[in-house]
């Protein structure tokens, strides 16, 4: 069972008084509609809150919005609606906050039917002041900032025009018409697709992919017969219609679209889809949907070029295009990902990989936990994690799994212990080692958040009744204290803390309801007095990530290196602080065959680490062989796994073979066999 508050465990002395002195209530003087909250900048303490209230009238919708600003992490708010001339703000566009610490904010206003264009309010001083700007177009999408220069904005109009501003929305220029999708790339490059014959939908599969590197002065067409495109890490992907049928295939570029290579992935039909699950500068996880309405597909992992793919996981749950998948990057430990598979019996099971998709396993059963009714064997079962799919199915799961890069090893998630995900009320589980081992942390569903880089975990019970109690732990969820933050319970709507988990403030949002009115209210609690002192060297202990067997010489080696971290000792009640930087020490491992993937035309027989030549090329492998670039077809059978840093040890050197000779097929004409694509 989860540790209770009554156990003789890490009590923080006088915490009630300390927290009471640091609890700040703010009642918002408006009717309850919707509320959205945005943090402006990093470590600035600036929060913008937009409340909107809709009254649907017979002919039109009357709306009212209010804008509030805090500069002390939510302890106090000031009504700044007058700065935006009491204009109604369109919530579907949200608040467009600039990258990094630019202090830029764009709000998109609702305008009356007959107007020539939309209206935005712009701030470049962390929302202290706003400038109203009337647009020469009606925006279809939220303004998109260039990641490299926050003065550069792009937006699509309702007329499918691509508009760019070079002076943070002051002046706008339409750089192209008939645009379906536009994205910023690196170095202020814009990629976009265009249609020729009427509409994006009608031309799907016949779109052109364009690039501009000078904000619209010049253009280059970098792809035709495009269905869609995506960016991930240093890779540009496009799904391209095949010449001969209605299937499409993925092509990849690592030079901004100048040259393309066919990816060695299965082609998909009209009802299927590709999805980039995760990507970094080393590699990409790609989901390829199965034919038919199965709700699952296959995960493939790429090589360092994004060209050769290894099958990573079968029966991967992914409902429909843009639908639900539980695929989660565990950001608190390198190489770890969690997702769900759909079993043959249609039950859903959780799988985890610790080596970037090389191997997937079930999650280890938490210590001292019983297997539930889904388990055939009451002693052998696994932990199954609730994520996006469970939330979409309206199960009693208020939050997806949580991990933070600066709270090393910590993963918090709702789950059940059995043979598959259960529809019963879940509990909250925690791992302190990146998912290798788990412990029940809290009984029943909760909202949770990480503060002070893992120094504090805060949780609130998920309940339909009003609440007035918050729980917190200073030892990675082993022991919990409860604090009553208000006499009068509120209907809870959300927990908010500054992104990045460095803050020591938490805001509890909700509303009060009386006979006639209901009002938004927030309580901001600062935990600084709970963690009275700054952490010192003696408060940290050394931890080896990915350790499974200390007797193994290469214990902890993942992708060719191991990492030791300084982690806060569980009993230390102190502040990591806002400037906390994770201290880690990497050490390179010797290479083994596990550090290499099989190159195109090779495979690993079961329970063998050697790559063996495929006797014949079939299906999408044959297509890749026929149409792929020649230099990708000469190989010694091995390629280092992307991001692998091993040195020495095994070096699988053998003769280089030209697989082009194997590209023969009776089904294709000789001229097609000789052709090759760029």
């Amino acid at each position: 069972s989860a540790p209770g508050e009554d156990e003789e465990c890490g009590r923080v002395r006088d915490f009630v008084a300390k927290l009471a002195n640091n609890t700040h209530q703010h009642v918002f003087d408006d009717l309850r509609g919707s509320v959205s909250l945005s943090w402006v900048g990093d470590s600035t303490g600036v929060i913008l809150v937009l409340t909107t209230f809709h009254v649907p009238l017979v002919i039109m919708t009357f709306g009212q919005s209010k804008l509030y600003r805090s500069e002390d992490y939510g302890k106090n708010f000031k009504d700044i609606t007058d700065l935006i001339n009491n204009t109604f703000i369109r919530t579907e566009f949200g608040m467009a906050i600039g990258p990094e610490n630019s202090g830029k904010v764009v709000l998109t206003a609702e305008v009356s039917g007959g107007s020539r264009g939309g209206r935005i309010f712009r701030s470049s001083d962390f929302a202290k002041n706003f400038v109203q700007t009337d647009l020469p177009f009606h925006p279809l999408t939220q303004m998109m900032y260039s990641p490299q220069n926050s003065d550069y904005l792009l937006a699509l109009s309702t007329e499918n025009g691509l508009w760019v501003s070079k002076n943070f929305g002051g002046k706008w220029e339409e750089i192209h018409k008939a645009v379906c999708l536009a994205k910023w790339g690196s170095d202020n490059t814009i990629f976009f697709t265009t249609y020729a014959n009427g509409s994006c939908k009608a031309d799907l599969g016949a779109l052109e992919l364009w690039r501009t590197s000078d904000l619209g002065k010049s253009f280059k067409t970098i792809g035709v017969k495009i269905y869609s495109f995506g960016l991930g890490g240093r890779f540009l992907f496009a799904s391209v219609m095949a010449d001969k049928d209605t299937t499409r295939r993925i092509h990849v570029s690592t030079d901004q679209g100048d040259t393309w290579s066919m990816a060695q992935l299965p082609s998909v039909g009209q009802e299927q889809f590709y999805s980039i699950l995760a990507a970094n500068d080393d590699m990409v996880f790609m989901h390829v949907d199965e034919p038919g309405d199965t709700g699952f597909g296959t995960i493939f992992t790429s090589d360092d070029r994004g060209i050769v793919y290894s099958k990573s996981l079968d029966r991967h749950l992914y409902t429909t295009t843009g639908g639900e998948t539980d695929f989660t990057n565990v950001t608190s430990l390198r190489g770890v990902y969690i997702t769900s598979v759909l079993s043959e019996d249609n039950s859903i099971q959780t799988m985890i990989t610790f080596d970037q998709g090389g191997r997937w396993t079930h999650l280890r059963k938490p210590e001292n936990s019983e297997c539930d009714a889904t388990a055939k064997n009451k002693n052998e079962c696994s932990l199954h994690i609730h994520a996006s799919y469970s939330i979409s199915q309206k199960l009693n799961v208020p939050m997806a799994p949580l991990s933070e890069p600066n709270a090393v090893g910590i993963v918090i998630a709702h789950g059940s212990v059995g043979d598959a995900i259960s529809v019963m009320v879940p509990d909250v589980y925690i791992s302190d080692d990146g998912g290798y081992s788990w412990t029940k942390m809290l009984e029943g569903p909760h909202y949770y958040t990480i503060l002070d880089s893992g120094g504090i975990i805060v949780a609130i019970e998920h309940s339909s009744r009003p609440i007035n109690v918050i729980k917190f732990s200073t030892d990675e969820g082993q022991c919990w204290q409860t604090y009553t933050f208000t006499r009068d319970p509120i209907y809870f709507t959300g927990l908010a803390s500054e992104p990045g988990a460095r803050s020591m403030n938490i805001s509890i949002w909700g509303f009060t309801e009386s006979f006639l009115t209901s009002q938004w209210v927030s309580y901001t609690i600062d935990f600084k007095d709970i963690l009275e002192r700054n952490c010192e060297e003696k408060d940290y202990t050394i931890w080896l990530a990915h350790s499974t067997d200390p007797e193994d010489y290469e214990d902890g080696c993942i992708l060719g290196y191991k990492e030791q971290f300084l982690r806060l000792a569980k009993s230390s009640v102190c502040q990591n602080g806002r400037d906390y930087v994770v201290t880690k020490q990497p050490s390179i491992c010797l290479c083994s065959l596990e550090d290499f993937l099989c190159d195109f035309g090779y495979y690993r027989p079961e329970n063998d680490s050697k790559c063996v030549e495929q006797p014949e090329l079939k299906g999408h492998d044959l297509e890749f062989c026929l149409y792929g670039r020649e230099e990708h077809l000469t190989t010694n059978g091995y390629r280092k796994i992307p991001g692998d840093k091993c040195q020495g040890g095994v070096n699988p050197v053998r003769e280089v073979k030209d697989l082009k000779k194997k590209c023969t097929s009776n089904f294709l004409s000789p001229e097609k066999q000789n052709s090759k694509s760029n």
Partner: antibody
């Protein structure tokens, strides 16, 4: 079976330094922390500090900070503890011990293998 | 640093007795506690780690319990070989030992 073999007894003058060695055999030396613990005559156990051979990551008890240096040589599977500015109160048996490990935490599972102890006498 | 207080400091008992030694931490250490046995002129020997896990090769008459700040080592039936000094040790953060409990023949 893992064994830790320590260097022989030492007699030292006040103000000087002593360096005690601890050689491991029969196990994976690099993957475990080695702690140094001392015991003055008729007294209890006192932890001085420890080291992880991979990367040489050492940490010390506050009482000995600045006076003790713990090092490790992976190639010979040997850990060393050097104590400087010796005084008569440093007369004790000095033990090296391997920290047991069930997970990635080096110091959380107790010391499962001990050396035989090295007697250091500080006397003028 | 975390202080560890062991009690009693000396304990007189007979063969076959049930013996209990307690150890209190100055702040919560969760379950990160070990127990050792030491005989004169010998190095300590690990009995229990993580408060209640028995080290391999240690007789099952030894058991540990507790979490947070209060811990107990129990010898269910004292044997002649068990007369020795026992130490607790916290392992969360910098290591500290308790003062020891000498179990002597009554």
């Amino acid at each position: 079976q893992v064994q830790l073999v320590q260097s022989g007894a030492e007699v030292k003058k006040p103000g000087s330094s002593v360096k005690v060695s601890c050689k491991a055999s029969g196990g994976t030396f690099r993957n475990y922390a080695i702690s140094w613990v001392r015991q003055a005559p008729g007294q209890g156990l006192e932890w001085m500090g420890g080291i992880i051979p991979i990367g040489g990551w050492a940490n010390y008890a506050q009482k000995f900070q600045g006076r003790v240096t713990i090092t490790a040589d992976e190639s010979t599977s040997t850990a060393y503890m050097e104590l400087s500015s010796l005084r008569s109160e440093d007369t004790a048996v000095y033990y090296c011990a391997r920290q047991g490990r069930k997970t990635g935490y080096y110091y959380y599972y107790g010391m499962d293998v001990w050396g035989q102890g090295t007697t250091v006498t500080v006397s003028s | 640093d975390i202080q560890m207080t062991q009690s009693p400091s000396t304990l007189s008992a007979s063969v076959g007795d049930r013996v209990t030694i307690t150890c209190r931490a100055s702040q919560s250490i969760s379950s990160w506690l070990a127990w050792y046995q030491q005989k004169p002129g010998k190095a300590p020997k690990l009995l229990i780690y993580k408060a209640s896990s028995l080290e391999s090769g240690v007789p099952s008459r030894f058991s540990g319990s507790g979490s947070g700040t209060e811990f107990t080592l129990t010898i269910s039936s004292l044997q002649p070989d068990d007369f020795a000094t026992y130490y607790c040790q916290q392992a969360d953060g910098h290591i500290t030992f308790g003062g020891g409990t000498k179990v002597e023949i009554k």
